[in-house]
Amino acid sequence: WPPPGTGDVVVQAPTQVPGFLGDSVTLPCYLQVPNMEVTHVSQLTWARHGESGSMAVFHQTQGPSYSESKRLEFVAARLGAELRNASLRMFGLRVEDEGNYTCLFVTFPQGSRSVDIWLRVLAKPQNTAEVQKVQLTGEPVPMARCVSTGGRPPAQITWHSDLGGMPNTSQVPGFLSGTVTVTSLWILVPSSQVDGKNVTCKVEHESFEKPQLLTVNLTVYYPPEVSISGYDNNWYLGQNEATLTCDARSNPEPTGYNWSTTMGPLPPFAVAQGAQLLIRPVDKPINTTLICNVTNALGARQAELTVQVKEGPPSEHSGISRN
């Protein structure tokens, strides 16, 4: 219907605008008029899809009128000025504000020109990750927990680990209406090898510039795993002192080391020094099985080592340490 040459007047606006719950947001909307075109704007109108009436109107002589005057404001439209900018500010965003809005210009001689804008109401979630301290169970159990609280829409949680494991993710309504709290558990069969290793919780959300990465240091409580080192099956009479070490991995840390032999207490040539056992030089061959017993809060475990001190001069390359 408009006269020839008037088809180029268009309304410019983004198709989608994000805004944060409780904050204010501007819905941008402009009338784009090419240089050679003539247009006169008398009214700016905002309406929400599915609702009766308009929520905001800027009239050439009456100025602005709003359905909710405390929550809406024309950003740039002024009485006596050209009405080319219909941008509307919304204050105190609520979940129910999410939806489709129409921005409309009443123009002459082109007629009405409008565009639709989708307002997306977001809530930025708070993210935490924590270890779930476990004992050896033989069954898969949650070993780490990642929580994204109060997001809109719900955050996406994924786990990254070289250890395998399975996620178990659930959602519940957040404290604020329309928000969601997402909880993800990382599940694995606990083992001592996993203790102290890291897994990463990755949280993705529309409101983040980039994903948030939260690292969890795993904790597995287990009794001591014990071995004895320092013996190379190549000890001879007349050699200098040697040292055996009781190597224990445990969580929590060992609380005590106890050295003994299968025959009972340590012989005189063996002196216990905590996790180490000092072997003094001997003048006759021996064949003794030594025991290291390590205790932590979860129990005690032991390791045995049979030590032989043989006759004959030590070779240049005997494998024992000399002091």
Partner: antibody
């Protein structure tokens, strides 16, 4: 105070033309589009067309098939409507009206009677 | 052209009555609807713009509502000076069109 004052009544013969004036005051003439609406006696309102005084841009109701011409004189803040090839069914009160999307101010009306 | 169908075409009511006039558009006009009051021998006077917003100086007993295709003008408590004809108008697209009018008489 915004005022739109129209010229007086006209009696015309079929086939003739009529030109009605609408002198404005109380506002900046070039900031508002001027439209014309007619109303046959005891009947409804019919939009004829509009003109933007600044650039002379016009829009017409196709029903008038090129019989109507809208013009302005910016120096006197006056709008004009000329209707040609008059017929008896053009007998009506013709109004000028200031456009604000709707029409917020109207002239007092000019009665045009077409009769042989 | 968009056809605006107004009803009733005429009605009478008593002072203090609540009066409702409706206007139906033949296609979606959003909220681009105005209402006018025309007293005998006078030009129309603008009451409502954008379907629901009152012009300054218009008594608040006049209320407009609606969007899309269905619109209503309500006079909450009729006064003697409201004796007039009422018209709706769409300004969504050219050619602008009016309802045929509702003549309101006072009983």
């Amino acid at each position: 105070e915004v005022q739109l004052v129209q010229s007086g009544s006209e009696l015309k013969k079929p086939g003739a033309s009529v030109k009605i004036s609408c002198k404005t005051s109380g506002y900046t003439f070039t900031e508002y589009t001027m439209h014309w609406v007619r109303q046959p006696h005891g009947k409804g309102l019919e939009w004829i067309g509009g003109i933007h005084p600044n650039q002379g841009e016009t829009s017409y109701n196709q029903r008038f098939k090129g019989r109507v011409t809208l013009t302005v004189d910016k120096s006197t803040s006056t709008a004009y409507m000329e209707l040609s090839s008059l017929r008896s069914e053009d007998t009506a009160v013709y109004y000028c009206a200031r456009w604000t999307g709707d029409f917020d101010y109207w002239g007092q009306g000019t009665l045009v009677t077409v009769s042989s | 052209d968009i056809v605006m169908t107004q009803s009733p075409s005429a009605m009478s009511a008593s002072v203090g009555d609540r009066v409702t006039i409706t206007c139906k558009a033949s296609q979606n006009v959003g909220t681009n609807v105005a209402w006018y009051q025309q007293k005998p021998g006078q030009p129309p006077k603008a009451l409502i713009y954008s379907a629901s917003y009152r012009y300054s100086g218009v008594p608040d007993r006049f209320t407009g509502s609606g969007s899309g295709t269905d619109f209503t003008l309500t006079i909450s408590s009729l006064q003697a000076e409201d004796l007039a004809e009422y018209f709706c108008q769409q300004y969504e697209s050219y050619p602008y069109t009016f309802g045929q009018g509702t003549k309101l008489e006072i009983k």
